[in-house]
């Protein structure tokens, strides 16, 4: 019999690389059975993630899997860092893994770094 | 169950280019990570890199940073490594291999394929 | 790049008997998210590696319970309680906290 607990599926050390001034959607994939949880999205800062309070957000209903977005119109170059979702059933706290946004300020397409050599420079988090 | 089936040439000259393909099956790469790993002739295991098939992106070892390209076909669900400027160190079983993003729960290895770099 | 260092590079054990390998990582394997990637494969000849254990101690499904993972940090190791004839097998540590992935240099478990 399938699991009726929160699932959040966003992959452990997931990645995306995304342009300054593009708009963007983090999204959160979450399964649940009944009733559908709190979820909300923060920002980490260290080891402490930082609640995103006023933030557009929005869910995207899908038939097995529903999606918990977190709007960037448009993306800035401070967007750039590691983001997580928690979702909150039962009195339980669901985390996610981390999802890491690499921010390229916008440049001339040929200046633009790749995505390889965005993930070889973990400096542009701090 | 999840499987993975290698495919590509045994054999490539040297300055050329290696080209090796791994088709899952058994899981919908998006929700995996696939990575590349090799084995030398009587060696032990090295990492080359692995994609996040969902958005393409990708992380090498450096020591082939330069070299490896590693790509993803979620319509076909399979994966692909490129090597290029192959000489003989680079003569090795080359394995693919997948995991479950989220949860570690599963992590399935190809069969491996047998490449020699050999004028 | 992390180094994993197992110990010994080679060991005979008697049928029955107990085997333990050891894996020292050169910096701690604990991640952010309090969870430690330490993962144990198993190659037997002519095969490709297999996964036993992950997450320091998890069994994969189908992994008889002979073998079990402990340690933490830097420190780990992985035990066959009473080895079998089909145990015979190089043994691989691997971390998945940090790129790049870096595997030891195996053991090689023989039957005596």
């Known amino acids: 019999k399938e699991s009726c607990d929160v699932q959040l599926y966003i992959k452990r050390q997931s990645e995306h690389s995304i342009l300054a001034g593009d708009p963007f959607e983090l999204e959160c994939p979450v399964k649940y059975c009944a009733n559908r949880p709190h979820v909300t999205w923060c920002k980490l800062n260290g080891t402490t993630c930082v609640k995103l309070e006023d933030r557009q957000t929005s869910w995207k209903e899908e038939k097995n899997i529903s999606f918990f977005i977190l709007h960037f119109e448009p993306v800035l170059p401070n967007d750039n860092g590691s983001y997580r979702c928690s979702a909150n059933f039962q009195s339980n706290l669901i985390e996610s893994h981390s999802t890491t946004l690499y921010v390229t300020d916008v440049k001339s397409a040929s200046e633009r770094p790749s995505k390889d050599e965005m993930a070889s420079r973990p400096w542009l988090l701090y | 169950q999840v499987q993975l089936q290698e495919s590509g040439p045994g054999l490539v000259k040297p300055s050329g280019t290696l080209s090796l393909t791994c088709a899952a099956s058994?899981?919908?790469?998006?929700?995996?990570?696939m990575y590349w790993v090799r084995q030398p002739p009587g060696k032990g295991l090295e990492w080359i890199g692995r994609i996040d098939p969902a958005n393409g992106y990708t992380r090498y070892n450096p020591s082939f940073k330069s070299r490896a390209t590693i790509s993803a076909d979620k319509s076909k669900n399979q994966a692909s490594l490129k090597l290029s400027s192959v000489t003989a160190a680079d003569t090795a079983v080359y394995y693919c291999?997948?995991?479950?993003?989220?949860?570690?729960?599963?992590?399935?290895w190809g069969q491996g394929t047998l490449v020699t770099v050999s004028s | 790049d992390i180094v994993m260092t197992q110990s010994p590079d080679s060991l005979a054990v008697s049928l029955g008997e107990r085997a333990t390998i050891n894996c020292k990582s050169s910096?701690?394997?604990?991640?952010?998210?309090?969870?430690?990637?330490l993962n144990w494969l198993q190659q037997k000849p002519g095969q490709s590696p297999k996964r036993l254990i992950y997450l320091v101690s998890k069994l994969d499904s189908g992994v008889p319970d002979r073998f079990s993972g402990s340690g933490s940090g830097t420190d780990f190791t992985l035990t066959i309680s009473s080895v079998q004839a089909e145990d015979l097998a190089v043994y691989y540590c691997w971390q998945g906290t940090l790129f790049p992935r870096t595997f030891g240099q195996g053991t090689k478990l023989e039957i005596k």
């Open positions: 291999a997948v995991y479950d993003g989220y949860y570690e729960s599963f992590d399935v």
């Open positions: 058994g899981v919908n790469i998006k929700d995996t990570y």
């Open positions: 910096q701690s394997l604990l991640d952010s998210d309090g969870k430690t990637y």
